[in-house]
């Protein structure tokens, strides 16, 4: 039993680091293996992971934590039953993906405007609850083409548009996603996505 | 209550060995990390060794290190520190003394909260 | 290793009065994770240790409020609003950032 591609870990800057990595044939990795993690500080004690499969031979461990700050550095063991498949270390801050924001709803009844909110995903005393931008995807479910990206490069969690500059009469889809330029994240997976249809009241011609 | 009891100090000649025992009662033993301290005669505190909750990682002052072994029991609830090729500057009250909370990722540091009451361990000819 | 220095060595105080002793490290206490690992113990005449202070400013469970701890980096400060006689004996500063831990060489207060 080997590892084929070394295990790579992100941290949510909270509470649970992901690592992945993929064996040299298909693994039952829940019975076949263990990944133990350590956090280099006084007294610390390893921590046992037991991953799951992902993929016939890709596994992936959802490694606890209870804080996460930036002088943190974790040393990781793959074990193979008595066997020491791989050594590395993870140092959470240099390999953060936020969380996902939640809650995204999309109010329409502020005249012609479109206000979307959603909810930080960190709490208030978490570094990252400060630093986060978003991006906004709407998209139409009836035109592939009508699809756009907003960036919110300040903090509030909302974003006002006009009504009409979407389509009126068609319903759009909308989700949004984060990231942090303090930490050069990756950015987080997309929220769930929401659904409205959209209608205004045409502006009146005068000719 | 949450206590913790020293015992098996006494008098040793020079390049003998002592083990002194601490048995901790009232707390999950297994939960904290456990120290050392000891007090010569009419000086300050030292701080002499230190073990993790598990037993997985211990430390050493550099007076000591190589000559006393700190270990644990954890199904007794007990701490030991075995001293070898004692010297006479090992003269000392020696202090078991509760440390940090170790069951957590990062380790809860709550003071050395809880001491024991002392055992005189005596290095001389 | 981390040096500590504790001032003043000897600290004579009338009951009633307040009280103060300075403990200096050699390098920060402070980690990242904003806590200063910097305690406070009291040996009374013929005891064991007892905590007062923990992470510099933290009552351990039991310690009158008449105790308090202050500081970050290097500089801390235990104070001792009203002095009692119970409060004799010798307070020592250790820090437990990292090993060996190290204590201050103690400060003995003695009443006037």
């Known amino acids: 039993m080997k590892v084929l591609q070394e295990p790579t870990c992100v941290s949510d800057y909270m509470s649970i680091s992901t690592c992945e990595w993929k064996m040299n044939g298909p693994t039952n990795c829940s019975t076949e293996l263990r990944l133990l993690y350590q956090l280099v500080f006084l007294l610390s004690e390893a921590h046992t992971c037991i991953p799951e499969n992902n993929g016939g031979a890709g596994c992936v461990c959802h490694l606890l934590m209870d804080d996460v700050v930036s002088a943190d550095n974790y040393t990781l063991d793959l074990w193979a039953g008595q066997q020491l498949l791989w050594k590395g270390s993870f140092k959470p801050s240099e390999h953060v993906k936020p969380r996902a924001p939640g809650n995204l709803t999309v109010h329409t009844n502020v005249s012609d405007t479109l206000l979307l909110t959603w909810s930080n995903p960190y709490p208030p005393d978490n570094y990252l609850y400060n630093h986060l931008t978003y991006a906004v995807n709407i998209w139409s479910e009836n035109d592939p083409a009508d699809f756009r990206i907003y960036n919110v490069t300040y903090l509030e969690p909302s974003l006002r548009i006009a009504a009409s500059t979407l389509k009126s009469g068609i319903s759009y889809r909308a989700r949004v996603r984060a990231w942090a330029q303090c930490y050069n994240t990756t950015w987080s997976e997309w929220s769930p996505s929401t659904k409205w249809h959209n209608s205004y009241r045409e502006p009146f011609e005068q000719h | 209550e949450v206590q913790l009891v020293e015992s098996g100090g006494g008098l040793e000649q020079p390049g003998g060995s002592l083990r002194l025992s601490c048995a901790g009662s009232?707390?999950?033993?297994?939960?904290?990390?456990m120290t050392w301290v000891r007090q010569a005669p009419g000086k300050g505190l030292e701080w002499v060794s230190s073990?993790?909750?598990?037993?997985?990682?211990?430390y050493y002052a550099d007076s000591v290190k190589g000559r006393f072994t700190i270990s644990r029991d954890n199904s007794k609830n007990t701490l030991y520190l075995q001293m070898n090729s004692l010297r006479a500057e090992d003269t000392a009250v020696y202090y078991c003394?509760?440390?940090?909370?170790?069951?957590?990722?990062?380790?809860?540091?709550?003071?050395?909260?809880?001491w024991g009451q002392g055992t005189t361990v005596t290095v001389s000819s | 290793d981390i040096v500590m220095t504790q001032s003043p060595l000897s600290l004579p105080v009338t009951p009633g009065e307040p009280a103060s002793i300075s403990c200096r490290s050699s390098?920060?206490?402070?980690?990242?994770?904003?806590?200063?690992?910097l305690d406070w113990y009291l040996q009374k005449s013929g005891q064991s240790p007892q905590l007062l202070i923990y992470?510099?400013?933290n009552r351990a469970s039991g310690v009158p409020d008449r105790f308090s701890g202050s500081g970050s980096g290097t500089d801390f400060t235990l104070k001792i609003s009203r002095v009692e006689a119970e409060d004799v004996g010798f307070y020592y500063c250790?820090?437990?950032?990292?090993?060996?831990?190290?204590f201050g060489q103690g400060t003995k207060l003695e009443i006037k």
């Open positions: 390098q920060s206490l402070l980690y990242s994770t904003g806590y200063n690992y």
């Open positions: 009232g707390f999950t033993f297994s939960d904290y990390a």
């Open positions: 073990i993790s909750g598990s037993g997985g990682n211990t």
């Open positions: 250790m820090q437990a950032l990292s090993t060996p831990y190290t």
């Open positions: 992470l510099a400013s």
């Open positions: 003394a509760r440390d940090r909370l170790t069951i957590t990722i990062r380790p809860r540091y709550y003071g050395l909260d809880v």
